[in-house]
């Protein structure tokens, strides 16, 4: 059952798996939730009546019944991990502690102009953990504006005191505000030769790649797969670091695959969700519980549907036997991995994907494409919604994109002449606009956020926010698109289409089926070229065809350029402007999403 | 005219690296992406990857991630294809080709430069 | 990724001749099709795009067409300057992939 509430003056006794120091309650219970085994915690607050040195302490749990006798105690804060919880999750925390120093490795240390420019350096600084600031008001003279960047190997702090005129923070990695580039790839036939600060077991390559990006001080990882020739070493997964923050040494062995750490990136990548089925492969852990299933999708679901299970093997039935239910063996270890990967015995192993939900949601894997044809088919599009206007008469304005449960990014020049969100209607699910009617459920606009460097579309900053009054419920049909990250600046996006229901041709009407189109992308110096009468800045995005045929055109604004990138769909442009539509070398001018990252973010988790 | 200037034909170790260029001229070189494209002996083509000259944004084919790196110099209007960790199968007549978009034919190619690799 | 396969190798063709190649994807490519000539010694150069587009310059002999899957190069009235080796290549998605290539020889 999930409980969020803190309980304040109260202890859970006994059940102790491990102590971090957190500077809060509730970034204990963060802590808490992303800890493989954590199910309940007990966090220490300041107070004259303890021990100065238990403040800050959060002490993580566990219990095999999923809860531990209360205790009263003064200053005690307890809770549960969000684990047991259906909400998404998010590691991210912005706040700024006020006359706390956080203790770590002080790696680097350097003058700012503030606690928000340290904060921004030490999110920029691919070691960087969290940081500590002292403020011009700092009595020793030489440490005023110095900024400590900070790391420790659990990523966490080694202690907290209390200290007068220093802040103290969090790197903002998580909150998908790093600049730092992404290394998406993985090298096969490669071993980077440098130290190992962890090692566990991996089915394969992505698992491990994943499990270096959530583990702290991972930055690049190796993983032995399992025709490695050193039988004790088969499905190990290396997870390495240097001072430099890349591999010293690059050896070229076979069987071996090695990649980078995707911290910076992974708002826009499946981290925790390790979902494929790993057939005639047996995990080995410690054992929960053993129940019958009909299937390993169904025994994924048990596993699922067990707050401690953390992966698991089937073994199929027997032909006839126990109603052709074979045996669910659910796990679970000290770090959430198994403690040893078997091959050849018949079973079919996965993981609980319970943990999904610490993923962002628009990494979810979504119905294969249509090739072929204009037209597209219910579900292919998820975040596509259409925006209606119902003033003088309702009618389709413009499109947009679903970017979070209460959130759609569409194009600032949709808006001329809107006088209030009042009058707007977003419809999200939609495939055709036939399907609309008066009793068709819609998500009011409480706000609409403008970019306010905005004059017209051509000059840029075509970009603008609706917060709906209600939250969007995910559904097949209706799911967010991932942001593109910053660190994939130097990415070129190959496999985009823009989608809306606007004119096929310059003198048209709305259509009433989504359409869509693959439309490569072009330079921006090709873009400036065909535009002499307007700047093409870097936050300007062209596509298009050299012999033109293929565009977005009227009613296709604020909609979507999504570009599918390592099997996750990115909204990299905004429908914006052109010269006529899918005319000879006149491309498309989309928002380049990228550049107004810190913007949506900004607007979009301001409190 | 149009015209893609190839570096002259390599001779290398095993294990080393090399880097061939490909000079641009006749058009707007950041207005292009460059594509680098591998024909070994008597084989056909083998796409390596392509760059956007405009901003050094890049793709590469995942068979030769790790393998090549790709890097433009706009002043000098010039492309390059790094290789690293050199074998024999890595001996091969390499290409370079522009295209204009992300999406389309490549129109124009270079002569071709020569990469013997030997022990 | 996508195959292309070009299931001729070689073709020997009577000067004058009309002359028919092959090209099938393993998946739809929507006409993202480029074929280009090769001659011995040379680089290749693009003779089509958009799998019937002809490029300046290139004679009207040739030409190109197909959808889907499966497309073709036909050369009407065949020249000596034509024996060369051809290649289909797709753009529809990356990595962007090569026929085999089809030799063209006169009889």
């Known amino acids: 059952e999930c409980v969020t509430q803190l309980l304040k003056d109260t202890c859970f006794e006994g059940g102790d798996i491990t102590t971090v120091f957190t500077p809060s309650a509730k970034y204990c219970q963060v802590v808490c939730t992303y800890h493989p085994r954590c199910l309940l915690f007990t966090f220490t607050a300041e107070s004259p009546s303890e021990d100065p040195t238990r403040w800050f302490t959060c002490v993580l749990k566990d219990s095999v019944t999923e809860t531990l006798p209360r205790v009263n105690r003064t200053a005690a804060i307890s809770g549960y991990s969000f684990k047991q919880c259906s909400h998404q999750i998010s590691a991210c925390n912005k706040d700024i502690y006020v006359d706390l120093d956080m203790k770590g490795i002080n790696y680097n240390s350097s003058v700012a102009k503030s606690a928000q420019e340290c904060q921004e350096r030490c999110t920029d600084d691919v070691h960087c953990h969290f940081f500590t600031y002292a403020t011009r008001q700092f009595p020793s003279l030489e440490h005023r504006n110095i900024c400590l960047l900070k790391h420790t190997q659990t990523g966490t702090p080694t202690r907290i005191t209390k200290l007068d005129k220093v802040v103290s923070g969090f790197s903002l990695k998580s909150c998908a505000l790093s600049n730092l580039a992404c290394i998406r790839d993985i090298f096969p036939n490669t071993v980077f030769a440098d130290s190992n600060i962890d090692s566990v077991m991996a089915p394969d390559a992505f698992v491990c790649g994943r499990i270096c990006t959530h583990h702290p001080g991972c930055l690049f990882f190796t993983f032995f797969s399992q025709e490695w020739p050193k039988e004790s070493q088969r499905n190990l997964c290396l997870l390495k670091t240097s001072e430099s923050g890349l591999p010293s040494t690059r050896i070229k062995k076979s069987k071996a695959l090695s990649g980078f750490s995707l911290q910076s990136c992974r708002h826009s990548i499946p981290v925790f969700c390790h979902s494929s089925f790993y057939h005639d492969t047996d995990f080995l852990g410690e054992e929960l519980d053993i129940v019958a299933a009909k299937s390993h999708e169904a025994c994924q679901k048990l596993c699922t549907n067990a707050v401690r299970c953390q992966f698991f093997t089937y073994t199929p039935a027997q032909a006839s036997c126990n109603e052709g239910k074979g045996k669910c063996y659910l796990k679970l270890s000290s770090n959430g991995s198994p403690t040893k990967i078997l091959h050849g015995r018949g079973g079919i192993s996965g993981y609980t994907l319970r943990l999904c939900k610490m993923d962002n949601e628009c990494t979810t894997k979504i119905k294969p494409r249509i090739v072929g044809g204009t037209a597209s088919v219910r579900g292919e599009w998820p975040w596509q919604v259409t925006l209606h206007t119902t003033s003088p008469t309702q009618r389709h304005l413009c499109g947009g994109s679903i970017i979070g449960n209460q959130w759609i990014l569409t194009a600032a020049h949709c808006f001329y002449g809107v006088e209030s969100p009042k009058i707007l209607r977003v419809y999200s699910g939609i495939l055709n606009q036939s399907e609309i009617k008066e009793d068709t459920s819609f998500f009011g606009v409480q706000e609409i956020i403008i970019h306010d460097q905005y004059k017209m579309a051509e000059s840029g900053y075509d970009i603008a926010l609706l917060k709906l009054e209600t939250t969007v419920n995910y559904t097949d049909s209706q799911r967010p698109i991932c942001l593109p990250s910053k660190g994939d600046r130097n990415v070129i996006y190959t496999d985009c289409w823009v989608t809306g229901w606007g004119y096929r041709k310059l003198r048209d009407k709305i259509q009433n089926t989504l359409q869509k189109a693959k439309i490569p992308l072009v330079t921006n110096e090709e873009c400036q070229k065909r535009y002499r009468g307007h700047k093409i800045t870097h936050k300007m995005i062209c596509a298009g065809y050299r012999e033109g045929g293929k565009d977005a055109c009227k009613g296709d604004s604020g909609g979507p350029l999504s570009c599918k990138h390592n099997e996750v769909w990115h909204l990299v442009g905004i429908t914006s402007w052109g010269e006529g539509c899918a005319q000879r070398e006149r491309p498309g001018v989309y928002t380049n999403v990228v550049e107004y990252v810190d913007w949506i973010l900004e607007k979009t988790q301001a409190v | 005219e149009v015209k893609l200037q190839e570096s002259g034909p390599e001779l290398v170790k095993t294990g080393a690296s090399v880097k061939i260029s490909c000079k641009a001229s006749g058009y707007s070189f950041t207005g292009y992406f460059m594509n680098w494209v591998k024909q070994s002996h008597g084989k056909s083509l083998e796409w390596i990857g392509f760059i956007n000259c405009y901003n050094g944004a890049t793709s590469y084919n995942q068979k030769f991630k790790g393998k090549a790196t790709f890097t433009v110099d706009a002043s000098s209007s010039s492309a390059y294809m790094q290789f690293n960790s050199l074998t024999s199968e890595d001996s091969a007549v390499y290409y370079c080709?522009?295209?204009?978009?992300?999406?389309?034919?490549?129109?124009?190619w270079g002569q071709g430069s020569t990469l013997t690799v030997s022990s | 990724d996508i195959v292309m396969t070009q299931s001729t190798s070689y073709l020997s063709v009577s000067l004058g001749g009309r002359v028919t190649i092959t090209c099938k994807a393993s998946d739809h490519i929507n006409n993202w099709l480029a074929w280009y000539q090769q001659k011995p010694g040379d680089a290749p150069s693009l003779l089509i795009s958009?799998?019937?587009r002809l490029e300046t310059g290139v004679p009207s002999r040739f030409s190109g067409s197909g959808s889907g899957k499966d497309y073709t190069l036909s050369i009407t009235s065949l020249q000596t300057e034509d024996v060369a080796t051809y290649y289909c290549?797709?753009?529809?998605?990356?990595?962007?992939?090569f026929g085999s290539g089809t030799k063209l020889e006169i009889k």
């Open positions: 958009g799998a019937s």
């Open positions: 080709a522009r295209t204009i978009s992300t999406g389309d034919s490549f129109d124009y």
């Open positions: 290549q797709q753009y529809w998605t990356t990595p962007f992939t």
